[in-house]
Amino acid sequence: SGVFQLQLQEFINERGVLASGRPCEPGCRTFFRVCLKHFQAVVSPGPCTFGTVSTPVLGTNSFAVRDDSSGGGRNPLQLPFNFTWPGTFSLIIEAWHAPGDDLRPEALPPDALISKIAIQGSLAVGQNWLLDEQTSTLTRLRYSYRVICSDNYYGDNCSRLCKKRNDHFGHYVCQPDGNLSCLPGWTGEYCQQPICLSGCHEQNGYCSKPAECLCRPGWQGRLCNECIPHNGCRHGTCSTPWQCTCDEGWGGLFCDQDLNYCTHHSPCKNGATCSNSGQRSYTCTCRPGYTGVDCELELSECDSNPCRNGGSCKDQEDGYHCLCPPGYYGLHCEHSTLSCADSPCFNGGSCRERNQGANYACECPPNFTGSNCEKKVDRCTSNPCANGGQCLNRGPSRMCRCRPGFTGTYCELHVSDCARNPCAHGGTCHDLENGLMCTCPAGFSGRRCEVRTSIDACASSPCFNRATCYTDLSTDTFVCNCPYGFVGSRCEFPVGLPPSFPW
């Protein structure tokens, strides 16, 4: 679709005569008839196949024709066509004399013709005017012409319809050849696909408008390149969605079980050494002079009764000091200046001389000890309490205060944590040194098998086209991460290419 435009510029008829040579009375009131038709080697009469147009009276005898296009007038003359411009044409321009106001062909005498010119040739679509001048014996016509495409038509022959648009069926303007030129931020055959934010992950992100990055399920971050860990994951990370890979020192399905209590909580005091011994369990090895589960209690150095032979102990800033009874000396009053003649053995102990009477030894009755049988037996000195139990003297007897999980006279018996069937949903219970452990059946997890978890939804390989499957444990479902070119919840659909149409 286009328009053949003809611009009449000047007509010269100096003598004011008709084609017959007869003069016009009073002068030649001149109008034009234009016939545009297909190319003919010899232009002959016949249908004006490309169109016709007539002008009103434009002047008398000789005159210049005013360019009237800006005012909506008739110059240049417009000959629209609704077909592919063939590139060739024939043009007939006739100048007629109008004796009256009726310009219809049937209202004019045949001899009212002033002049007739006929041209033919090639003409390409374009903005440039071709200037021409045709001269006969009596007249001269100067004019120019061109072919331009109608609005929204493009190409060498005005055959390509293209309408710029900016809606969801396309975001483009039209190039001179009729091809689409996408607006910034859009791509695709019809410029309907947005260009996502630079760096937006090709598989895990998408967009509905330019410079956007919307994440597919299981992914997050500005560029959708960060996986979302399992819901409830505390001290863990992921490399694919819904994972929970525990940080060092943490365990369990949600990485919420502390396996490194020592580092995370530093429970041991006074420079003690901490050793992890299980989940939320630890042991403190105290430095000399300290005691307690966390080595939080300072020991009196006299508590170990270091002074022998009835010596009395005094605590000092840097240790202790023994005050020896008469007849004894040494750091711990361990040396005697006595002999059996001095009756050194108390509480019914028997004295035996040694080293030819230079020394002696006491044989003590039951319940007494010490080099002079001066001490009642401390039944705790032999550390009879097992498993970290605390020994307590109770008069003539002793007793063990056991740590949690142990019982018996000497804390030698391990209390079975499994006795009360703590494992839910048929979990198997195992006694451990510091507690218990449940081995859970399929579909359950947690310290006591109390959490219902997903049977691996990916086990059935539900994803197609080499997609990666992730189990979403929070919903017992799977998520397929599609390779490029596929979509759908199972990646079962190839991204459709625009179909070919018969036109």
Partner: antibody, heavy 121, light 106 residues
């Protein structure tokens, strides 16, 4: 050949939400060449465009209905759906789902057979 | 909001040409589609992008669009062409239908 089929209740009470689903068979709803739209026609009246959706989930709604309309897509089921809230008797119409072609300049070349939804108490 | 105006009815004798107009502001700058709807049936696309025919649509259906008016022309009209005809265009991101024209084949 691609076919579209609407489904949903034929009777909805005033102030409730109208819900319809369109199932696409014979082709993928995930084609980049098409939008999937809803059009309605009150008895004896003309066609009214409600809105459409792309397989990525991008939606476009008629401004006169926008506050009440939600269109969603489920590529795994090859379906898209319409929800119209706070309905009145004026929403009584035959509801069509249709395929709008990007290469067709937005022309709808495939239509469902339509389902009549009556709003009445 | 954008409006498309159609004549309510057009009558034509069999074998003659029926022309249905659709008017809208600068409609020629938009692509027009035309749909045929027979009683009790779903609409059928007969013209898209002003003048293109989908496969299966007879050649007697043609379209044009310029200025403010799009035209659907049915040349050599047949009795089976009796139906309602709707024009449609896109205004930004909104689909707009004309009010419809009933074509009666006398």
């Amino acid at each position: 050949e691609v076919q579209l089929q609407e489904s949903g209740p034929g009777l909805v009470k005033p102030s409730e939400t109208l819900s319809l689903t369109c199932t696409v068979s014979g082709g993928s709803i995930s084609s980049s060449s098409y939008y999937w739209g809803w059009i309605r026609q009150p008895p004896g009246k003309g066609l009214e465009w409600i809105g459409d959706i792309y397989y990525t989930g991008s939606t476009y709604y008629n401004p006169s209905l926008k506050s009440r309309v939600t269109i969603s897509v489920d590529t795994s089921k090859n379906q898209f759906s319409l929800k119209l809230s706070s309905v009145t008797a004026a929403d009584t119409a035959v509801y069509y789902c249709a395929r709008e072609g990007v290469p067709l300049g937005g022309g709808a070349d495939k239509w469902g057979q339509g389902t009549l939804v009556t709003v009445s108490s | 909001s954008y409006e498309l105006t159609q004549p309510p009815s057009v009558s034509v004798s069999p074998g003659q040409t029926a022309s249905i107009t659709c008017s809208g502001q600068r409609l020629g700058d938009k692509y027009a589609s035309w749909y045929q709807q027979k009683p009790g049936q779903s609409p059928v696309l007969v013209i898209y992008e002003d003048s293109k025919r989908p496969s299966g649509i007879p050649e007697r259906f043609s379209g044009s669009n310029s200025g403010d008016t799009a035209t659907l022309t049915i040349s050599g009209t047949q009795p089976m062409d009796e139906a309602d005809y709707y024009c449609q265009a896109w205004d930004r991101d909104t689909g707009v239908f004309g009010y419809g024209t009933k074509v009666t084949v006398l």
